[in-house]
């Protein structure tokens, strides 16, 4: 969480953003909230990036004001029109891109004062696992699979009941580049593998965390995913 | 100096609709939210509706969906609220009131009253 | 819909002492709550936004506190004027639910 405050003394008004991430290829959110303020007219949202000479979006007198807007960010960008009213200057990014990385500026006017906060915007590929019991396999096995990682995540098995254990012995992971030629298949395998246990597929790269969980026992298969963003930092 | 001027009280048949006006002046019109807000005899105060002029859009309170309707007309700085399929329970001072977020200035009030 | 409530639902204080007035919502509302006055037969009027920020004309015994779910308004020497309901309100989402209130009467 960035708090950020207006230089001009008494004229400040405090802008909050929270460091996030993108998903490549998805729409992405940068989150920014203001101190509202009554007088809609006055409030000027201003999105910048570091190293970027346009600006990424800008919205004032209610409407979106794209002029100056850089190109890299032509027809991507929105705010949250009717949101602004309370306080929230957050931009939508559509089809968030690896280039969409580096550190963005919330710059707010008010009929209050001025105010602004950094924010770290980090982008990849992340997906959730999904991990099944591999019947062709000659023994008992797991196969985890996730269809999009990026930058190449690390795997890792455990398990409930071997707490601790360490499976690198008794696991294979692949990376398989798909079509667009920069995110990746995960695909792990665990072998010997013992029913009345629940094994765990722990996915990981400095963007997310991802885990699949299955509970193999004579009568069922139970499953369960689970994905956290990594730094998500408010400013 | 602001003044949210409001149409007068009204009595009106369960069943029918009412239409409220709010005359705005003393400031630009379109650069602030309208909001409806209501009382009932000895009740609290209830939210129901905010347009935003210069955005052009409205909420509404998920009680009153379906039966609100607000709007504004920029060339006369005038608010208006209708509220249809009155019930008895809809008998109340009707406010206009400049904002969200928050509201600094109000209208002086029309009183509806919805009887057989 | 976040839920507003105030405590107590009237209050007995005499002129000249301190009232604390209580508002809680159901989740955090961050900063964004506001305080109204409203007497008998009139509209309701605007005390404080922002939790603190007093609102033009308003006199400086009117103080609010607070942050995320519980806040209070404190008026710390009560005068005549002073009696009558008192609202508070979140605008941290639409939307923008009002408290249930406070009586302030004359002990």
């Known amino acids: 969480l960035i708090i950020g405050f207006g230089i001009s003394g008494r004229h400040s008004i405090t802008v909050t953003t929270v460091a996030s991430a993108g998903n490549i290829g998805e729409d992405g959110i940068l989150s920014c909230t203001f101190e509202p303020d009554i007088k809609l007219s006055d409030i000027v949202i201003q999105w910048l990036k570091e190293g970027v000479i346009g600006l990424v979006h800008e919205f004032k007198e209610g409407k979106d004001e794209l002029s100056e807007q850089d190109e890299m960010f032509r027809g991507r960008t929105a705010v949250f029109a009717d949101q602004v009213i309370v306080g929230n200057a957050s931009l939508r990014l559509k089809n968030v891109q690896l280039t969409d990385a580096g550190t963005y500026k919330c710059y707010i006017i008010t009929s209050k004062g001025k105010g602004n906060a950094n924010l770290e915007y980090k982008t990849g590929a992340f997906s959730m696992p999904e991990v099944n019991v591999d019947y062709n396999a000659s023994s008992e096995t797991l196969r985890c699979e996730a269809p999009r990682w990026f930058p190449q995540p690390t795997v890792v098995w455990a398990s409930q009941v071997d707490q601790g254990a360490n499976f690198s012995e008794v696991s294979n992971t692949s990376f398989e580049l798909n079509s667009e030629n920069v995110t990746m298949k995960v695909v792990s395998v665990l072998y010997n593998v013992t029913i009345n246990n629940t094994y765990s597929c722990m996915i990981e790269n400095d963007i997310a965390k991802a885990t699949g969980d299955i509970k193999v026992t004579e009568s069922e298969i139970k499953r369960r995913s689970h994905l956290q963003l990594l730094n998500s930092k408010a400013s | 100096q602001v003044q949210l001027v409001q149409s007068g009280a009204e009595v009106k048949k369960p069943g029918s609709s009412m239409k409220v006006s709010c005359k705005a002046s003393g400031d630009t019109f379109s650069s602030y939210a309208i909001s409806w807000v209501r009382q009932a005899p000895g009740q609290g105060l209830e939210w129901m509706a905010g347009?935003?002029?210069?955005?052009?859009?409205?909420h509404n309170a998920q009680k009153f969906q379906g039966r609100v309707t607000i709007t504004a007309d920029k060339s006369t700085s005038t608010a208006y609220m209708e509220l249809s399929s009155l019930r008895s329970e809809d008998t109340a001072v009707y406010y206009c009131?400049?904002?969200?977020?928050?509201?600094?200035?109000w209208g002086q009030g029309t009183l509806v009253t919805v009887s057989s | 819909e976040i839920v507003m409530t105030q405590s107590p639902a009237t209050l007995s204080v005499s002129p000249g002492e301190r009232a604390a007035l209580s508002c809680r919502a159901s989740?955090?509302?961050?900063?964004?709550l506001a305080w109204y006055q409203q007497k008998p037969g009139q509209a309701p009027r605007l005390l404080i936004y922002g939790v603190s920020t007093r609102a033009t004309g308003i006199p400086d015994r009117f103080n609010g506190s607070g942050s995320g779910t519980e806040f209070t308004l404190t008026i710390s020497s009560l005068q005549s004027e002073d009696f009558g309901a008192y609202y508070c309100?979140?605008?941290?989402?639409?939307?923008?639910?009002f408290g249930p209130g406070t009586k302030l009467e004359i002990k």
């Open positions: 347009i935003i002029p210069v955005f052009g859009t409205a």
């Open positions: 009131t400049r904002g969200g977020p928050y509201f600094d200035y």
């Open positions: 989740q955090s509302v961050s900063s964004n």
């Open positions: 309100q979140q605008y941290k989402k639409w939307p923008f639910i």
